[in-house]
């Protein structure tokens, strides 16, 4: 089941999926001046069996000016511009992508890919949030959102990350700094 909406946006933070559930689709988008090759795939699809998951289809872009040149899918580091799903720069990765059954890794970039990736997530997908540069988390609690099915409708849980500007003092006045470990992931409301 596809999630109806995108993961929630929160102030001064970005989100990233560490792995993608089977059924996830990634649009084959090309950067300005390029287009999908004729009869090329509209999207990549995370598929698999009990032991292995991978992305079906290939995204291929060609120059809008020329009709015959095909650009193959080859990782181009210079093309990895900022996306909605840019790799988080957190020292601790919450999930090892390779170790999660029924999930695909982040697909490698394709030549002349658009700067923003558009994913279509499925129920059960989890995304992780971190504060953008210049902001820091108010505490170490849950910083994720999960797409859940509730009463026949899909919804994302609200991430509980609060990002505050660095202009604030590093020790907030009145802030307690307990030695507790982070709590579990946000849950949806109980059934009606």
């Amino acid at each position: 089941e596809l999630c109806d909406d995108d993961p929630p946006e929160i102030p001064h933070a970005t989100f990233k999926a560490m792995a993608y559930k089977e059924g996830t689709m990634l649009n084959c988008e090309c950067k300005r001046g390029f287009r999908r090759i004729k009869s090329g795939s509209l999207y990549m699809l995370c598929t698999g069996n009990s032991s292995h998951s991978s992305w079906d289809n290939q995204c291929q872009c060609t120059s809008s000016a020329t009709r015959n040149t095909t650009k193959q899918v080859t990782p181009q580091p210079e093309e990895q511009k900022e996306r909605k799903t840019t790799e988080m720069q957190s020292p601790m990765q919450p999930v090892d992508q390779a170790s999660l059954p029924g999930h695909c890794r982040e697909p490698p970039p394709w030549e002349n890919e658009a700067t923003e990736r558009i994913y279509h997530f499925v129920v059960g997908q989890m995304v992780y949030y971190q504060c953008v540069q210049g902001y820091r988390a108010l505490h170490r609690g849950p910083a994720e959102s999960v797409c859940k099915m509730t009463h026949g409708k899909t919804r994302w849980t609200q991430p509980q990350l609060i990002c505050t500007g660095e202009m604030e003092t590093s020790q907030f006045p009145g802030e307690e700094k307990p030695q507790a470990s982070p709590e579990g992931r946000p849950e949806s409301e109980t059934s009606c």
């Epitope: 102030p11 709590e183 849950e187």
Partner: antibody
Framework: EVQLVQSGAEVKKPGESLKISCKGS????????IGWVRQMPGKGLEWMGI????????KYSPSFQGQVTFSADKSTSTAYLQWSSLQASDTAMYYC?????????WGQGTLVTVSS | DIQMTQSPSTLSASVGDRVTITCRAS??????LAWYQQKPGKAPKLLIY???SLESGVPSRFSGSGSGTEFTLTISSLQPDDFATYYC?????????FGQGTKVEIK
């Protein structure tokens, strides 16, 4: 159904202490921030601050820093707001809210009256 | 803290009227703004979040718009149940702050 249920109205004298409560149900209490909002008689809403019940991290609004204390007991899904020495100016309705950003669920409010 | 200013403070209107309330922020809050409705003796109720997203269960006659520093809450056709006080709240920069409120009363 998500609910925040607050303790009943209180009448106190200046200088007395007080602790009011807010019990959450219908969701994972530890995983959502709880905020507190004050509304003085006939006035607007004022943000007091926020607490994470999961690890008791707190952040007070500057106006309320040192005036009140937030606490939470995740085993009973209850958040608390307390005063060590009430003043007449603390007379107000106090709401607990589920945060952390827009406030989607509100308690019914606890009316605190401080009068000699 | 970011200051939020609502106008007007009081608004007299009739059932069926189109009503618009404005909220201005002292600095940009992007789209991180919510609107609440409060009736006498009751807790506030969330109407709109992220400037224009309608909270589940809220009638479609309520709508929000704006970004940056200027926002509006519109009631397309005022109903008897809509006479109340409305507040905006920014959640872009901690501490969160509310507008002073706009009371919508019967003309």
């Amino acid at each position: 159904e998500v609910q925040l249920v607050q303790s009943g109205a209180e009448v106190k004298k200046p200088g007395e202490s007080l602790k009011i409560s807010c019990k959450g149900s219908g969701y994972s209490f530890s995983n959502y921030w709880i905020g507190w909002v004050r509304q003085m008689p006939g006035k607007g809403l004022e943000w007091m601050g926020i607490i994470s019940p999961g690890d008791s991290t707190t952040k007070y609004s500057p106006s309320f820093q040192g005036q009140v204390t937030f606490s939470a007991d995740k085993s009973t899904s209850t958040a608390y707001l307390q005063w060590s020495s009430l003043q007449a100016s603390d007379t107000a309705m106090y709401y607990c809210v589920r945060g952390p950003y827009y406030l989607d669920y509100w308690g019914q409010g606890t009316l605190v009256t401080v009068s000699s | 803290d970011i200051q939020m200013t609502q106008s007007p403070s009081t608004l007299s209107a009739s059932v069926g009227d189109r009503v618009t309330i404005t909220c201005r922020a002292s600095q940009s809050v992007s789209s991180w703004l919510a609107w609440y409705q409060q009736k006498p003796g009751k807790a506030p109720k969330l109407l709109i979040y992220k400037a224009s997203s309608l909270e589940s269960g809220v009638p479609s006659r309520f709508s929000g718009s704006g970004s940056g520093t200027e926002f509006t809450l519109t009631i397309s056709s005022l109903q008897p149940d809509d006479f109340a006080t409305y507040y905006c709240q920014q959640y872009s920069s901690y501490s969160w702050t509310f507008g002073q409120g706009t009371k919508v009363e019967i003309k």
